[in-house]
C-alpha cells in the first residue's frame, strides 16, 4: 500500500506524459489522478515508467474500478497488462478482437503467461467458439496455442478455422488432439483436389484412421518418413505392405531406419516376412512363413 | 552502423569542471531515454544519470545530485554529462546506454558506448 | 535495492557448467538483467527479463528466477567466457548493479 502523501507544489500532473517519467513512488501516488489517468490510458505506453511505478498506477485504476476495468481502458493498457493477475482479469469482459491483439502484442516474444492463458480464455468464452480470426490471431502470437487446448475446448473450433492452422501450430498436439482436429481438416478441406488436399491435411494425419490412410495410398502421395511416424500405431496396423509401399512411394527406404521404433516397429511385427520381404530393405521381425495368424480381436467380437 | 561515442574525458583538479559528450547514430535517438553509467578502476558500474527522450525530464543518483546535469540535443543526436564541483570519487571510466526498448518498463541497455576516462586528481 | 553477487569471483575450466547467483535486497519480480564484461571493454547485454536470451547470445548462456533470488548459467565454459559478469535490476530507481563476478581460468 502506497501512503498517502500530499503532491508537491508545481507537480500535479495535468496530463499523463512524459514529465512523470521519474517520478518517485509516492509521488505518483499524490500527483496523478485517477481518472485523468483512466482517460489517457493510451499514453502510458508511450512513457518508459518502471515496475514499481506501473504497480503504482494499476493501484489507482483498481480503486478507481474494483469491479473491474471497462474495455475502454483494457485497450489501451499497454505494458500495464504486466502487472494484471489472472484474478484482475476475470473481472473483465474483453469482447473486441483488437483489444486482444493489443495486449497479446504487449507480451510478445515471451512465454504464454497466466495472465495471457486467463485472458485468452475469457475472450473465447465471451465469443462461444473459437472462430477463425480469433484462431489467426493467437497462433501468430502463439503458434502452439492450438496445441494447449484440451480436446474438449478444441471441439468448439469451427472446421472454417482450420484454414488457419499451419503446420508449426501442430507441432506439440498429442494423438488425442489430432483426433478432434482430423475429422474437421477433413471437412475443411474436402473440396480440394488430390495432392492440394495432402499437402493441407498432411499434418493433422496423427488423427487419422486406418480407412482414410487406406484412401490415400491409392493417390500417389508420397507421404514423407516423419509424418508417416506421428501416425497413430492402431491406424497404421491394418495396413499391409503394399499399401505402405504405395502410401511412402519412394520414402519407402526411410522404413529401414525405423525399424525399431513405433509405429513401423509394430508394423513390421503384423506382417508376413514374405511380404516384407518384396520390399527389398531387409526388414526383419515378421511373421514367419506358414504361421496362421488368428485375429482375437475379431474373434471375441463375433462371439 | 549503430553507436555511442563519448568524449570529453580527462584530468581535473578536485572542484573541478568537465563536459562530457556522447554521440549517437544509427538509431532514432529522440525516441529513447538515456543514460550514464560509471565504472570506478577495478570496481563495478553505478548509474549516475537518465534523461528522457525530449529532454524534459531528468534523474540522478544520490552520490552525484546537485553536481551534476544530464542534457540532450536531439537535433545534433547527442547526450551531455555537465560534471562540476568534482570529486576524487567520481573517477571513473563514464559510459553513455541506450535503453533496448523505446517504450516499455525495460530500464536495460543494449547498447554502449566504449567510455570516456575521468579523473579528478591534484 | 541492493544486489548482493555471489560468488565475487570463481576459477573454472574450459567446458565447466558455471552458475553464478544475484540476490536482492527486496523483491523484484523478473526485472533483471545479466551483463558481461571484458577489460577494456563496455558491458554486453546477455539476459533480460531474468531468462529471456538476447539476440545473438549463445545459447550455453541461461537465466531464471524471480522475486528475490536469480541465476545466470553457462551450461559449458568457452574460452571467451571468461570475464566478469554483472547482474542488475530495473524495477525500480535508481537502477542498480550488482557487485560483479569474475570468472577466471583455472
Known amino acids: 500500500e502506497v501512503e498517502k502523501t500530499a503532491c508537491p507544489s508545481g507537480k500535479k500532473a495535468r496530463e499523463i506524459d512524459e514529465s512523470l517519467i521519474f517520478y518517485k513512488k509516492w509521488e505518483l501516488e499524490a500527483c496523478v489522478d485517477a481518472a485523468l489517468l483512466a482517460t489517457q490510458m493510451d499514453r502510458v505506453n508511450a512513457i518508459p515508467f518502471t515496475y514499481e511505478q506501473l504497480d503504482v498506477l494499476k493501484h489507482k485504476l483498481d480503486e478507481l474500478y474494483p469491479q473491474g476495468y471497462p474495455e475502454s481502458v483494457i485497450q489501451h493498457l499497454g505494458y500495464l497488462f504486466l502487472k494484471m493477475s489472472p484474478e484482475d482479469i476475470r473481472k473483465w469482459n474483453v469482447t473486441s478482437l483488437e483489444t486482444l491483439k493489443a495486449l497479446l502484442e504487449v507480451n510478445k516474444g515471451h512465454e504464454m503467461s497466466p495472465q495471457v492463458a486467463t485472458l485468452i480464455d475469457r475472450f473465447v468464452k465471451g465469443r462461444g467458439q473459437l472462430d477463425k480470426d480469433t484462431l489467426d490471431t493467437l497462433t501468430a502470437f502463439y503458434p502452439g496455442y492450438l496445441c494447449s487446448l484440451s480436446p474438449e475446448e478444441l471441439s468448439s473450433v469451427p472446421p472454417s478455422s482450420i484454414w488457419a492452422v499451419r503446420p508449426q501450430d501442430l507441432d506439440t498436439c498429442d494423438p488425442r488432439q489430432l483426433d478432434v482436429l482430423y475429422p474437421k481438416a477433413r471437412l475443411a478441406f474436402q473440396n480440394m483436389n488430390g495432392s492440394e488436399y495432402f499437402v493441407k491435411i498432411q499434418s493433422f494425419l496423427g488423427g487419422a484412421p486406418t480407412e482414410d490412410l487406406k484412401a490415400l495410398s491409392q493417390q500417389n502421395v508420397s507421404m514423407d518418413l516423419a509424418t508417416f511416424m506421428k501416425l497413430r500405431t492402431d491406424a497404421v496396423l491394418p495396413l499391409t505392405v503394399a499399401e505402405v509401399q504405395k502410401l511412402l512411394g519412394p520414402h519407402v527406404e526411410g522404413l529401414k531406419a525405423e525399424e525399431r521404433h513405433r509405429p513401423v516397429r509394430d508394423w513390421i511385427l503384423r506382417q508376413r516376412q514374405d511380404d516384407l520381404d518384396t520390399l527389398g530393405l531387409g526388414l526383419q521381425g515378421g511373421i514367419p512363413n506358414g504361421y496362421l495368424v488368428l485375429d482375437l480381436s475379431m474373434q471375441e467380437a463375433l462371439s | 552502423e549503430v553507436q555511442l561515442l563519448e568524449s570529453g574525458g580527462g584530468l581535473v583538479q578536485p572542484g573541478g569542471s568537465l563536459r562530457l559528450s556522447c554521440a549517437a547514430s544509427?538509431?532514432?535517438?529522440?525516441?529513447?531515454?538515456m543514460s550514464w553509467v560509471r565504472q570506478a578502476p577495478g570496481k563495478g558500474l553505478e548509474w549516475v544519470s537518465a534523461?528522457?527522450?525530449?529532454?524534459?525530464?531528468?534523474y540522478y543518483a544520490d552520490s552525484v545530485k546537485g553536481r551534476f546535469t544530464i542534457s540532450r540535443d536531439n537535433s545534433k543526436n547527442t547526450l551531455y554529462l555537465q560534471m562540476n564541483s568534482l570529486r576524487a570519487e567520481d573517477t571513473a571510466v563514464y559510459y553513455c546506454?541506450?535503453?533496448?526498448?523505446?517504450?516499455?518498463?525495460?530500464?536495460?541497455?543494449?547498447?554502449w558506448g566504449r567510455g570516456t576516462l575521468v579523473t579528478v586528481s591534484s | 535495492i541492493q544486489l548482493t553477487q555471489s560468488p565475487s569471483s570463481l576459477s573454472a575450466s574450459v567446458g565447466d557448467r558455471v552458475t553464478i547467483t544475484c540476490r536482492a535486497s527486496q523483491g523484484i519480480s523478473s526485472a533483471l538483467a545479466w551483463y558481461q564484461q571484458k577489460p577494456g571493454k563496455a558491458p554486453k547485454l546477455l539476459i533480460y527479463?531474468?531468462?529471456s536470451l538476447e539476440s545473438g547470445v549463445p545459447s550455453r548462456f541461461s537465466g531464471s528466477g524471480s522475486g528475490t533470488d536469480f541465476t545466470l548459467t553457462i551450461s559449458s565454459l568457452q574460452p571467451e567466457d571468461f570475464a566478469t559478469y554483472y547482474c542488475q535490476q530495473f524495477n525500480n530507481y535508481p537502477l542498480t548493479f550488482g557487485g560483479g563476478t569474475k570468472v577466471e581460468i583455472k
Open positions: 527479463d531474468a531468462s
Open positions: 534523461i528522457s527522450g525530449s529532454g524534459g525530464s531528468t
Open positions: 544509427g538509431f532514432t535517438f529522440s525516441s529513447y531515454a
Open positions: 546506454a541506450k535503453r533496448r526498448d523505446s517504450y516499455g518498463p525495460y530500464w536495460y541497455f543494449d547498447l
